[in-house]
């Protein structure tokens, strides 16, 4: 028989976890002993089962872990893992601080939407991934030409709004272009906005003439290039 002991103490060296609000926190207390010990979690010295926590918690006993998603300021506190068997018990304290982030303009993932080359008649998907503290809204714009010009007298580009949507934070927004023609070629912009401001990123769609099926191998419908 053996009292509980930590099997990977080096993984437990980070005692203070300062995490931005909305992030996921994982505490681990990997242990062993004979008989195999059990693990319980306390928050500020009280038994913690997460029943009062929006989103609850995930306890993975085989991984000796506690997982909390989308942390909020009320999750701040001291989290104790209590590992025990018939021979003895050990405990370890983690401190959680939840940092309230400053709401910012939406951040668009670099490289999205991506420049894309497609063949006439194929389908194209343009992707835009938005990170935003406040709920963002998205517009897909196509830059258009009016009277032979891409810009108005004021110097601003002519655009056509193709799609408007409210999305959840960190969701991927997709613009589907079905059965593309040469007229669909051009510059497309993903615009994301929230209460702080707007952010834009653009990509070019190149549309190639239909290839001769007698010599073309089965090619993918669209090719993405950076």
């Amino acid at each position: 028989q053996q009292a509980p002991y930590w099997t990977h103490p080096q993984r437990m060296e980070k005692k203070l976890h300062a995490v931005p609000a909305g992030n996921t926190v994982k505490f681990r207390c990997p242990a062993a002993g004979n008989p195999t010990p059990t693990i319980r979690w306390l928050k500020d010295g009280q038994a913690f089962h997460g029943e009062n926590r929006i989103g609850g918690i995930r306890l993975r006993h085989q991984h000796w872990s506690l997982v909390m998603e989308s942390v909020v300021p009320s999750d701040r506190g001291t989290y104790t893992c209590l590992v025990e068997n018939a021979v003895g018990s050990i405990r370890y304290n983690y401190l959680l601080d939840v940092l309230e982030r400053s709401p910012h303009r939406p951040i668009l993932q670099a490289g999205l939407p991506a420049n894309t080359t497609a063949v006439v008649g194929s389908d194209v998907e343009l992707l835009c991934k938005v990170y935003s503290d406040a709920q963002p809204h998205i517009q897909w714009l196509k830059h258009i030409v009016i009277n032979g010009s891409s810009f108005g007298a004021d110097g601003f580009p002519y655009v056509q709004v193709l799609k408007t949507a409210d999305i959840n934070s960190s969701e991927v927004e997709v613009l589907y272009l079905r059965n593309v023609s040469a007229e669909d070629a051009g510059e497309y912009t993903c615009l994301a906005g929230n209460s702080i401001g707007l952010s834009y990123q653009s990509a070019w769609l190149t549309v190639l003439p239909e290839e001769d099926p007698t010599w073309t191998a089965a090619a993918p419908e669209a090719r993405y290039t950076d």
Partner: antibody, heavy 124, light 112 residues
Framework: EVQLLESGGGVVQPGRSLRLSCAAS????????MHWVRQAPGKGLEWVAV????????YYADSVKGRFTISRDNSKNTLSLQMNSLRVEDTAIYYC?????????????????WGQGTMVTVSS | DIVMTQSPDSLAVSLGERATINCKSS???????????VYWYQQKPGQPPKLLIY???NRFSGVPDRFSGSGSGTDFTLTISSLQAEDVAVYYC?????????FGGGTKVEIK
């Protein structure tokens, strides 16, 4: 003409409440976030609060958090600032400012249109 | 919070001469979309601030071309190439990238 007109300012004692209003005209009010910014006499500009176009998101400066509440009535094109537990240091001109629009904008995405301001004096 | 530090506090320039106002932010205002979100305002006594420059270097409509904005990342400059009598005012920089939005302390421009 795009216009913002604040009202509701006045002299009030510390600890009391006041409600400011801002009437918007000349643009689609319900498509824009709106802000309050204040300026103490002879001092610089201080951002106070913002509300999203539909009222679902609100953020405040730490100096007013828990005391001030920003709200809007899109059917009446009005923005409000409910100020409770007023302090002497809240004395300022309060400006209503248009923020980011809900979609593509030609030019700046907000902070382009300011009202004339309304004076709030907190004094015993 | 992002701190905006303006210099100088005041500036006396002869008519027709160049006026240069500096602004420094405590963190980069270059956003992921490639734009730098610093704005410049002019405020005359008894009036609300008026937007001059947005997104670092874009002149707002109706603003004379003697006003220009430049800089990158954390260091920004508003330049009045040839000061006119009507340019006497207080000038403010502002960061418009995250809340709380913050302003510089202001620079008072006078005629020498």
């Amino acid at each position: 003409e795009v216009q913002l007109l604040e009202s509701g300012g006045g002299v009030v004692q510390p600890g009391r409440s006041l409600r400011l209003s801002c009437a918007a005209s000349g643009f689609t009010f319900s498509s824009y976030a709106m802000h309050w910014v204040r300026q103490a006499p002879g001092k610089g500009l201080e951002w106070v609060a913002v509300i999203s176009y539909d009222g679902s998101n609100k953020y405040y400066a730490d100096s007013v958090k828990g005391r001030f509440t920003i709200s809007r009535d899109n059917s009446k094109n009005t923005l409000s600032l409910q100020m409770n537990s007023l302090r002497v240091e809240d004395t300022a001109i309060y400006y209503c400012v248009r923020g980011a629009g809900r979609g593509y904008t030609y030019g700046p995405d907000g902070f382009d249109i300011w009202g004339q301001g309304t004076m709030v004096t907190v004094s015993s | 919070d992002i701190v905006m530090t303006q210099s100088p506090d005041s500036l006396a320039v002869s008519l027709g001469e160049r006026a240069t106002i500096n602004c420094k932010s405590s963190q980069s205002l270059l956003h992921s979309d490639g734009k730098t979100y610093v704005y410049w305002y002019q405020q005359k006594p008894g009036q609300p601030p008026k937007l001059l420059i947005y997104e670092l270097s874009n002149r707002f409509s109706g603003v004379p071309d003697r006003f220009s904005g430049s800089g990158s990342g954390t260091d920004f400059t508003l330049t009045i190439s040839s000061l006119q009598a009507e340019d006497v005012a207080v000038y403010y920089c502002m960061q418009y990238i995250e809340a709380p939005l913050t302003f510089g302390g202001g620079t008072k421009v006078e005629i020498k």
